[in-house]
């Protein structure tokens, strides 16, 4: 089952996710989505990185940590009850079915 994380309405939520980059100049793309991790990619993508940068995001979502060193933990700003649910952090490791998938449950009080 998913690991559960809690936050209060109006506060920022933190959903941890980490990996170890092979090399600084060659990061692994990561996606965050709302909903459990599907077979491929992320559903309802809220944020995405490429080999160097955050290249897609929606307004209340960001990576506050040092994502270029593998801290791809998601921050959600000013949460509401509607933010409750499962989130998928997917480390998109090259190769067939090599992705690391983490389902995290966010509970808003």
């Amino acid at each position: 089952s998913e690991v559960e994380y809690r936050a209060e309405v109006g506060q920022n939520a933190y959903l941890p996710c980490f990996y170890t980059p092979a090399a600084p100049g060659n990061l692994v793309p990561v996606c965050w989505g709302k909903g459990a991790c599907p077979v491929f990619e992320c559903g309802n993508v809220v944020l995405r990185t490429d080999e160097r940068d955050v290249n897609y995001w929606t307004s209340r979502y960001w990576l506050n940590g040092d994502f270029r060193k593998g801290d791809v933990s998601l921050t959600i700003e000013n949460v509401t009850l509607a933010d409750s649910g499962i989130y998928c952090c997917r480390i998109q490791i090259p190769g067939i079915m090599n992705d690391e998938k983490f389902n995290l449950k966010l509970v808003i009080k």
Epitope: G25, R52, D53, V54, N55, N64, F67
Partner: antibody, heavy 114, light 108 residues
Framework: QIQLQQSGPELVTPGTSVKISCKAS????????INWVKQRPGQGLEWIGW????????KYNEKFKGKATLTVDTSSSIAYMHLSSLTSEDSAVYFC???????WGQGTTLTVSS | QIVLTQSPAIMSASPGEKVTLTCSAS???????LYWYQQKPGSSPKLWIY???NLASGVPARFSGSGSGTSYSLTISNMETEDAASYFC?????????FGGGTKLEIK
């Protein structure tokens, strides 16, 4: 010590193109990104794009796609920026900056005038 | 793209005065990649503060930086003459990387 040495000032006519260089020294050129930044007189800074010399991969600010082309010569540790179809709007100081923006070239002044 | 708004655009301070410059982001950015630069006329920008709060080499201890998410600041505890310059905030976590419009800090 790490240094980024840029080519000298350029005075060119509208419609032409120019190639600015940035010679890196003091580190392994192919291991670190090179960024390019534009600054118009008395104005702020704009990121043009980056190039990773180890692979030749590039990323451009959408605003500069079709205007700037970034390349490298790994044998001489030089990064280049080619600017095409020049207009007066391209008159600016152009800087190269290191991987983490901790080292900057001295800037190349480009003047586009007829 | 993330818009960085600096305020004030221009300010003057007397020697010894405490000065705070702010940088507001239109969306949250990684505090690891929020930088500040000092620039004087005719010179390249100099890295001044990196990763929100770390002073670059040679930067006097009267400077400090703080913030997270969408709100960042640079503070000078006691203004000195040599601090008169333009200061730019910069985020390079989200592509395209962006700079604030700058604050021109003058000495009274």
């Amino acid at each position: 010590q790490i240094q980024l040495q840029q080519s000298g000032p350029e005075l060119v006519t509208p419609g032409t193109s120019v190639k600015i260089s940035c010679k890196a020294s003091g580190y392994t050129f192919t291991d670190y990104y090179i960024n390019w930044v534009k600054q118009r007189p008395g104005q702020g800074l704009e990121w043009i794009g980056w190039i990773y010399p180890g692979s030749g991969n590039t990323k451009y600010n959408e605003k500069f796609k079709g205007k700037a082309t970034l390349t490298v010569d790994t044998s001489s540790s030089i990064a280049y920026m080619h600017l095409s179809s020049l207009t007066s709007e391209d008159s600016a100081v152009y800087f190269c900056a290191g991987d983490r923006f901790d080292y900057w070239g001295q800037g190349t002044t480009l003047t586009v005038s007829s | 793209q993330i818009v960085l708004t600096q305020s004030p655009a221009i300010m003057s301070a007397s020697p010894g005065e405490k000065v705070t410059l702010t940088c507001s982001a239109s969306s949250g950015v990684s505090s690891s990649y929020l930088y500040w630069y000092q620039q004087k006329p005719g010179s390249s920008p100099k890295l001044w503060i990196y990763s929100t709060s770390n002073l670059a080499s040679g930067v006097p201890a009267r400077f400090s930086g703080s913030g997270s998410g969408t709100s960042y600041s640079l503070t000078i505890s006691n203004m000195e003459t040599e601090d008169a310059a333009s200061y730019f905030c910069h985020q390079w976590s989200n592509s395209p990387y962006t700079f604030g419009g700058g604050t021109k800090l003058e000495i009274k």
